[in-house]
Amino acid sequence: VEVQVSEDPVVALVDTDATLRCSFSPEPGFSLAQLNLIWQLTDTKQLVHSFTEGRDQGSAYSNRTALFPDLLVQGNASLRLQRVRVTDEGSYTCFVSIQDFDSAAVSLQVAAPYSKPSMTLEPNKDLRPGNMVTITCSSYQGYPEAEVFWKDGQGVPLTGNVTTSQMANERGLFDVHSVLRVVLGANGTYSCLVRNPVLQQDAHGSVTITGQPLTF
């Protein structure tokens, strides 16, 4: 028996369902009574789901997994993972044993889009050219860790005096806070871009300083 999985990682959004595809080629006359199917975490061998002795043995992994029972006899051993969490990320091995056996691993990459950044300024009044200001760009609830880029109004990258921190919450999602310290010109626009490297999703925020009032 030869087991086949997708070579590319499966990308799944947090709280959505994901399908880890796995297939094998059943011989003529194959019956499910012959099938021994195991899904396990590759790095720990923790059992995720199994089908043995002609029946689905169910989920051994937080009761969020399911097979496609009607398709098993055709060689479809794919696994459905419901309500994906950050902690589900990793490699899963599909092991099929009939007379002989084979296995293959598929990677699950979890992702969550970042929110539109909010911009804050400190100080936020009585601003004059030559003042040092701190601009904070905050974006929330994304995964994996973001890449943050700052630019001025002419699109020139601002790399000096940038401090970025990323903190994971209890669900493993990241809140990003990036701080730019800059000396004000007569006027100017400062924009931050928060990029999710897996989703290739960009979230933009900007602040324009033209004397009073400020424009966000």
Partner: antibody
């Protein structure tokens, strides 16, 4: 040729320590889980410990938990077993074994003898 | 006491067929590969059979089968050089340990 070669066995007093090594050759060491299995004189085989490819996951038999540590150095193609607080009942031949993706220990070393005695 | 149960001894005359059984549970043999090892006196164990698959170099006189939570090793055309200890083993995904049978000493009469 696929080969595993254990070393480091010897005579040690109860309560003492010993470190066993297993040098792998002829295959991509970092692609396999690895195990230690032992056999006391005149007894059967007993699995001791196992480790995954990158060393991030380790499992132990209850009889050695907290006393033995399995580790690996993929750059040196070497598996280790650090044995502390040794007891007379740890006296055995210790084998290292390659553990493949199908849950088969398919290649074994020739073994190294550990004797715990005062 | 071993997690996998196999008879302590078996015997047969040259040319005969002998079988050795191995009984486990759903968390090991029931869903995991069952392996058979031959250990000749004074040597390291050697892989003989995995489920019903023989590694290259193992004579086809040796065969394995698995049904539910039990497995068996059959040797046909018994030869004097088959005299050895035979062990069954499987990964147990509830215990997260490898489990072995106590071993069966095969005597060729």
């Amino acid at each position: 040729e696929v080969q595993l070669l254990e070393s480091g066995g010897g005579l040690v007093q109860p309560g003492g320590s010993l470190r066993l090594s297993c040098a792998a050759s002829g295959f991509t060491f970092s692609s396999y889980w690895m195990s230690w299995v032992r056999q006391a004189p005149g007894k059967g085989l007993e699995w001791v410990a196992g480790i995954n490819r990158n060393g991030g996951t380790t499992y132990y038999a209850d009889s050695v938990k907290g006393r033995f540590t399995i580790s690996r150095d993929n750059s040196k193609n070497t598996l280790y077993l650090q044995m502390n607080s040794l007891r007379a009942e740890d006296t055995a031949v210790y084998y290292c074994a390659r553990w493949n993706d199908y849950d088969i220990m398919d290649v074994w070393g020739q073994g190294t003898t550990v004797t715990v005695s005062s | 006491q071993s997690v996998l149960t196999q008879p302590p001894s078996a015997s047969g005359t040259p040319g005969q067929r002998v079988t050795i059984s191995c009984s486990g549970s759903s968390s090991n043999i029931g869903r995991r590969t069952v392996n058979w090892y031959q250990q000749l006196p004074g040597t390291a164990p050697k892989l003989l059979i995995s489920n019903s698959q023989r590694p290259s170099g193992v004579p086809d006189r040796f065969s394995g089968s698995k049904s539910g939570t039990s497995a068996s090793l059959a040797i046909t055309g018994l030869q004097s050089e088959d005299e050895a200890d035979y062990y069954c083993a499987s990964w147990d995904d509830s215990l997260n340990t490898w489990v072995f049978g106590g071993g069966t000493k095969l005597t060729v009469l």
